[in-house]
Structure formats: C-alpha cells, structure tokens
Amino acid sequence: KLTIESTPFNVAEGKEVLLLVHNLPQHLFGYSWYKGERVDGNRQIIGYVIGTQQATPGPAYSGREIIYPNASLLIQNIIQNDTGFYTLHVIKSDLVNEEATGQFRVYPELPKPSISSNNSKPVEDKDAVAFTCEPETQDATYLWWVNNQSLPVSPRLQLSNGNRTLTLFNVTRNDTASYKCETQNPVSARRSDSVILNVLYGPDAPTISPLNTSYRSGENLNLSCHAASNPPAQYSWFVNGTFQQSTQELFIPNITVNNSGSYTCQAHNSDTGLNRTTVTTITVYAEPPKPFITSNNSNPVEDEDAVALTCEPEIQNTTYLWWVNNQSLPVSPRLQLSNDNRTLTLLSVTRNDVGPYECGIQNELSVDHSDPVILNVLYGPDDPTISPSYTYYRPGVNLSLSCHAASNPPAQYSWLIDGNIQQHTQELFISNITEKNSGLYTCQANNSASGHSRTTVKTITVSAELPKPSISSNNSKPVEDKDAVAFTCEPEAQNTTYLWWVNGQSLPVSPRLQLSNGNRTLTLFNVTRNDARAYVCGIQNSVSANRSDPVTLDVLYGPDTPIISPPDSSYLSGANLNLSCHSASNPSPQYSWRINGIPQQHTQVLFIAKITPNNNGTYACFVSNLATGRNNSIVKSITVSASGTSPGLSAGA
C-alpha cells in the first residue's frame, strides 16, 4: 500500500522535511503532490512526468519544494504555514490511480521560561496566588512542577490561559513548595528556575500527646503540646483553668487520683496574633477498669455502612485485644485495626458480620474481657424463593407454596394470583386444586426498615394432561469446536420423567453428551457440524406423555481448506481458464481471488478468456466466514504454454 512517511514528523522552523514515499507502484505515468488531504488542482504543489522527467509547478508551489524521481518531496526552509497534510497522487492510467496522505507539524524553538507571581507571602485560607509562565509562546504546551512532581489533582489548583497561569485558591501550608514551569513543543522543551512559596499559617488546634487519658496511680504524667504554625507557636499550660507554665511540655511525676482533671494547652502565633487551645481530661485510676465496647453505628446497613468498634477506656501503655465469634480476628481487607489496636473498623458490613465481638485489656497479671457485643446488620430482602420448584400440577392435589427471602428485620410476605392480592402470609395453601387455579403466583417480600421490596413470579399450570413440552437453548448459533450448548426441557413438572431423542433415535453414548437436572437438561460440549440434528424432548408420568417439536441445531463451522477445480495446472495458450473454488462452511463463505498476490474479484468462479503465457503464476482462493470469524486459503500454480510446444497439455475450460 502506498504510504507517506514524514521525516521528521515534527519540524522546527527554518529546517527541512522529507515526505518519503513507500511502496510506489510500478509502470507509472506520473505523480503529483497537493497541499491538503485530497487531490485538488487549485492546491497542486508540483507534478512530475516520468517519461519526460519534467517537473511542473502548481498553484501551491513556493519555490522551496524539490520533487525526486522516487516521488519523495523535500520542503526546505520550513515556515509555520507549512504545517498540515500533503497528498501524493500517483497516476497510472484512466483514473485507476492511487493516493496517499502524509502530514507534519511545524514548531518554533523555545526560550527558557520564568515564573512571575502576584503574591510572595500569602496567608493560609485567605489569599490566592497566581503564577504565570513567561513568555507567552504560540503552539507551546505549558507544564507545571511542584517539588519536581507533576501537578496534583485539586479543586484549589486551576490552570488557565492555556495552562500558562497556575492559580492556587485559598492557599494552605501544603502549598509551601518549589514551583517550576516548563514550556514544550515537539521540537524543544525548556524549564524555568524554581520559585519557593512561603505560606503563613496557624496556629492549628494544638495536639496533646500521648492521646491516652487514663493513667494508673504512681505513673509519671508527661504531656507534650504541638500546633502547626508558621512562624512556630508559643505554648502555655493550664490545669483545671489555672496557669501552670509557658513550655511546650508539662511533666508531673508520681501522679495520684488528685491529679485527675482538665489539662489545657494554648498555642499562640505572634505574627497573626491568633490563639488556639485544646483540652484533654485526664483520669487517674487506682485499678484498671473493666473494658467495654462502644459503636458508632448500632444498626448498620449491608454493603453501605462501615462500623467502628472502640474498646474503652483509653489507658496508657496498654495492649488491646479483639475476638470475633470467640476467635482471634481473621485476616480480611474489610477488617482494619487502628495503630493502637483500640478501634476495630468493619468496612462495608455484610450480614455475616453480626459477631459477637469482644475486646480485652491486657495488664501485667491478666486479660480483662468486655461483655460481648452483637451487631444488628440490616439487609435484604433478597429475591424471594418460591418452593417447591414445580410448575405443573394435577387437579385434585393440594397446592402448598412457601416463600422465603433473606432479610433483617425479617421480611413481610404477600401473595398475589394473576395480580390480585390474596393474603399476607409466608405460605399459601389451596386444597383440592382445579384447572381454574392455573395462573401467575407472585410472592412479594418487603423489608419494613429499608422500605425495599422484591418479588418473584411463578407460573402454575393445573392440568390432567401433561402439556406439550418445549426446548429452550442457551446458544442458538454455536461455533464448531468452541461452544457448548445446553438444551432444557420445559416445563418443570412434579413426578415427571424426562426423555431425549436425536434424529428420532435415543441418545447415543458420547463423552460430549451430558444429562443433568433430573434429565431435564441435555448439554453438548464442543459442538461439531455433525451435531446439527433434530433434538426432541419428552415428558411422561403415570397419566400421560408428550413430546416437544424438534429443535434443529444450527452449528456454525468452517471455512475448511478450499478446493480449486478443475485440478489441472497446465494449459495451452488460447484456452479459457475457468477455476471454481469451494469450501465447506456454514454460513456460506465469501470468496476472493488473488493472482500473483494481486487482488482480483470477490466471486466463487474465476474466468479468464484466451489465456497466454502472461497468465502464468500463483492463483490463490481466499475464503472467509464472517459468522465464525475464521479464514482459509489455498494456492494453485498455473502454467500456460505456447500452443503446440508441449504435448499433453489441457485445453482449458
């Protein structure tokens, strides 16, 4: 196939580009280049006549183009306006021509960029900062780097002005970083020097560590306060509202129950004049307390809610343990323990997560267990199941249907027959049924907590005679050696025997045939074309018997390796060549011919009148089955001899 390769594809202004032609056909009259994606006399650049070796300029010729005998086009001293598509039109004869399109893009060389900023010391949660990458350059891509990484995704970061401007809205301390911009085009890339953003912030609400609030008598109390702040904060401590000291740490040795109370840390930022405080309540115990479990959600919804179970109280230097169903925690991506093991989080709870859950506090002597906690997980209703599964009943028997749908709280049930409400019970009982009881039986399950309802519909047939069965199939057009087909005999009936016939005969013994589901289902594995037969199913009980209409399996296969006829390969000059190609295939394949690799016609028969030695060569028949997606081919060599030069040659068709 004729193709154009641009070398290079992206061209710098002032340089040159070669539009290189590949697979140029033989025996040409000439060729012509056009600006754009199509042949257009008004946009011809240059033409070349092979016989006279003459180049003829066209309306789009600029004097910078050189055409070569191999049809390639060199464009020198490239300008911006040269960007775009170029079409080569190869002229053979009588408009049986070929064309191909290539393209290239023109870009300028870029200078080193720099960053300008509208605010050098922004205040957190108040100011915005706009960085602009200079200079503005046409056809350039602007990129930004934060700490030498690409920009994070954030609603506070906005690129505008063709990505030239980076705006940080409501700056935060995390925006304190090194910023660089980069200009790029396909022929060059330049990066600016870095600009450091210094954000003033804080103080935040101070954090008092350690976090535990329960201590044993006789321990040392050592509290540390920290508040994120720029510039750094100054700290003060208060115990039960009374000022203690202006330090970042508070130390009280050998505490007693009397040291219980509220401990306040105050952080102050001298630049902003802002103060923030945090209070922690410290409890000093004489003995370790019995643990108990608190939950953030007492009635979680399945597949929606997460539940966090916390072991109370919080005690310093204590090991927390957990048990589920009286066993240690299983490994599960849905179970997460906090760093101190005090909080157990169940992500996306399921109905199986009810528990019970226990936590324990380990001390030097023993492990204290909490009381067990059971989760009440709300779920369902699932799709109701109506049992038994029979759809066919004889008159006179009792009809007893039961409905069940998994649900918490338990589902409320309603029965409808042919759309009419019957009763609000889980079971439906009708004694001594008749044909009039045939119909659509609907069970509706409702969860009062979620308000969700689910229904299942079952068709019940009451008849003395067995109905005429039918065959359902899971695949109407299986592909040979690839697909399996499962036939099911409908309907499912009580106290019924199911039978199968293939082409009027009972089932052959074959490892590819399998009966299941009480002989109701017949599965054919790895179907073959020989399985394209008539399949019949039958049902019988003590009263009656019936057979389905036959179902014929339409197996898609092929195409097989084609056969070219007649088999002759030697012909006399002047004879007619009449080759026919055939391949077994379902559906029928599409045929095409190639002579010496050149595509011919899409027909089953190839006819050439009065052949000559010029017709020597390889004749290939290609077959394609669109349904199976498979292809096949065969090649035949044909030799044509001049009349009378070789005895015994075929005269042709």
Partner: antibody, heavy 116, light 106 residues
C-alpha cells in the same frame, strides 16, 4: 473505463428550478472533485462550482451563489446540480467534469432550455 | 475573480498553416493554465496542462508556452481535424475560462 452519464434535456419556465444529475462509474468516486461547467448557445465555457463526494465540500462561482446547490449521493455514485430562479439567460448545455492534472473526463452534457 | 482574455475571438486559416492563439490573465497565475479544444455538439477535450505540457495522446503539433499573465497555444501545421473552438483556463484560484477562439477554414 471512466464514464460520466448525465440526465436528459429539460425545458423550464422562468423562475422555476432545474436539477441535473451526473452518474459516475469506472473510478473511485470519492477521490476527485466533480466540477459543473455550462455553455450558453454559441458562447464560451463558464465554471459554476465543484463538490467533493467524500464529504460534500463545495466551492461555488460567486456569480451563482445563492442560486446553485450541488449535492452528492455516494450510494449511487451520483452528483446533482440544482439551479433555481431560472431566467432565459440560463439556457445552456450543463456539463459535469473531472478536471485534474494530466487527465480530464466530461459528461455528454444536458441541455436546459428556459422559456415562457 | 481572475479573468482570462483570449484573442483573437475567431480566425480563418488553411490546412498546413501555423496558428497562434493568445490568452492574458488579469493577475499572475504562474504556469497554472490549461488549453481545451471543443468541436460542435461535443464536450471540451484537454490539450495542454501546466501551460506547456501535452496531455497523453495529444499530437506534437500542439504546443503551449508562457507564465505569469501571458500564455500562447500554437498549432505548428493545421490539420483538417483541428478546426474547432479553443479555450484557455486558469486553475490557480478556482477555475476561469477564456471566452474562446473559433478556428475556421479559410
């Protein structure tokens, strides 16, 4: 071989419209511009415009803008030229043509007579 | 729009004569000019492209020359089948034809 077959002669009253068809065969229909050229009796050739069958892109002679519409039906490889608000000076033979570097093909022409 | 002015509008000549037809463009069109021959009741037939190059199958007695705004079609030795109307055409900016030169038998 390349053939451009045009529709038959038409007689129209002033103010009416005429639609001439040009059915192409023997080449890749969507590769080349189709031009329309007219020739009044005893007069020279006048280029009316062109259409590209691949995307129905058109260029019209300013003289005919607003009166001429060129369309294409790729399913039948046919190009149409419709001229509206006909006047007596529109009486001419209308040709469709493929005119490119080193080759040209013309239809047989369609005589349109405008007479009251 | 570019105008193409052709001269003469008609010309009488004899078989064997050398005939020259000229065409002038209203602006520079480079060498983007073609010449056509038309016989009565027939569609035009292209003779010359790019001002001076013969189409395949056109006899060598037909030649073209010129560039910019002035163009010439020359028939070196008139044959009986050459009596027809000749048109120049520019394809530098869309398409414009000259008004034609009718070549008649003297």
């Amino acid at each position: 071989q390349v053939q451009l077959v045009q529709s038959g002669a038409e007689v129209k009253k002033p103010g009416a419209s005429v639609k001439v068809s040009c059915k192409a065969s023997g080449y890749t229909f969507t590769s080349y511009w189709m031009h329309w050229v007219r020739q009044a009796p005893g007069q020279g050739l006048e280029w009316m415009g062109r259409i590209h069958p691949s995307d129905s892109d058109t260029n019209y002679n300013q003289k005919f803008k607003g009166r001429v519409t060129m369309t294409v039906d790729t399913s039948t490889s046919t190009v149409y030229m419709e001229l509206s608000s006909l006047r007596s000076e529109d009486t001419a033979v209308y040709y469709c043509a493929i005119v490119e570097w080193m080759f040209d093909y013309w239809g047989q022409g369609t005589l349109v007579t405008v007479s009251s | 729009a570019i105008r193409m002015t052709q001269s003469p509008s008609s010309f009488s000549a004899s078989t064997g004569d050398r005939v020259t037809i000229t065409c002038k463009a209203s602006q520079n069109v480079g060498t983007n000019v073609a010449w056509y021959q038309q016989k009565p009741g027939k569609a035009p037939k292209a003779l010359i492209y790019s001002a001076s190059y013969r189409y395949s199958g056109v006899p060598s007695r037909f030649s073209g020359s010129g560039s910019g705004t002035d163009f010439t079609l020359t028939i070196s030795s008139l044959q009986s089948e050459d009596f027809a109307t000749y048109f120049c055409q520019q394809y530098y900016s869309y398409f414009t034809f000259g008004q034609g030169t009718k070549l008649e038998i003297k």
